[in-house]
Amino acid sequence: HSDGIFTDSYSRYRKQMAVKKYLAAVLGKRYKQRVKNK
């Protein structure tokens, strides 16, 4: 079912982004985010 495939794909993408965030905390970022002026 296409909805199920989409849901699974989106779920995996969200997990991938979470892993990327955790790895970035270990490896550091090439470009550090600048604090925006309010």
Epitope: K15, V19, A25, V26, L27, G28, R30
Partner: antibody, heavy 116, light 112 residues
Framework: SVEESGGRLVTPGTPLTLTCTVS????????MSWVRQAPGKGLEWIGI?????ITYYASWAKGRFTISKTSTTVDLKMTSLTTEDTATYFC??????????????WGPGTLVTVSS | AIKMTQTPSSVSAAVGGTVTINCQAS??????LAWYQQKPGQPPNLLIY???DLASGVPSRFSGSGDGTQFTLTISAVQCEDAATYYC??????????????FGGGTEVVVK
């Protein structure tokens, strides 16, 4: 650049500390890993010191290997050495998140020989 | 802990031919995979990172593909200087143990 030192011939059970000296960049900005290679064998990941100063180790290395750092060095402390630990030990600078291949650096390695 | 299984352990190729090396991860590592070339007496040299990105200075005959658990390094139009041992390295994150990494067992490429 990165360069390892401290490798030598030791007897089984002897502790040994290897040092990775870095120049041209800050350890605050890069994670550093230790990798080893037994003679004629493959590469084996030991552990990593993150930019957050948290260390992670391969399951087989936990408890016997310890990674620490100063402002310009990353040390690998090894205890209870056995002949199985005979290898060339490499220090490597890791690629940052959103970084490129120029981030990756390997030292020439330092040879540790454990023999009675 | 993550485990990387690399095949074949050795492969022979003629100059101008194509070599394919496979690497399988024990868990989903997304695209967190690198390939290295190592020649005797030298440290490894990065070829591919993030599964398919070519490292700077590496000839375009080297290419990487894959995502998840299955990855491939392809060497097209093999040259004599490509004779070396090739390794994959995967990186994973576990909620239990955090950062983890492992290398494949290596593939020796012999060029005829």
């Amino acid at each position: 650049s990165v360069e390892e030192s401290g490798g030598r011939l030791v007897t089984p059970g002897t502790p040994l500390t290897l040092t990775c000296t870095v120049s041209g960049f800050s350890l605050n900005n890069y994670a550093m890993s230790w990798v080893r290679q037994a003679p004629g064998k493959g590469l084996e990941w030991i552990g990593i010191m993150g930019v957050n100063d948290i260390t992670y180790y391969a399951s087989w290395a936990k408890g016997r290997f310890t990674i620490s750092k100063t402002s310009t060095t990353v040390d690998l402390k090894m205890t209870s050495l056995t002949t199985e630990d005979t290898a060339t030990y490499f220090c490597t600078r890791e690629i940052r998140d959103d970084g490129d291949s120029s981030d990756k650096l390997w030292g020439p390695g330092t040879l540790v020989t454990v023999s009675s | 802990a993550i485990k990387m299984t690399q095949t074949p352990s050795s492969v022979s190729a003629a100059v101008g031919g194509t070599v394919t090396i496979n690497c399988q991860a024990s868990e989903d590592i997304y695209t967190n995979l690198a390939w290295y070339q190592q020649k005797p007496g030298q440290p490894p040299n990065l070829l591919i990172y993030d599964a398919s990105d070519l490292a700077s200075g590496v000839p375009s005959r080297f290419s990487g593909s894959g995502d998840g658990t299955q990855f491939t390094l392809t060497i097209s139009a093999v040259q004599c200087e490509d004779a070396a041992t090739y390794y994959c390295q995967g990186v994973a994150w576990s909620s239990n143990t955090g950062y983890g990494s492992a290398f494949g067992g290596g593939t020796e490429v012999v060029v005829k």
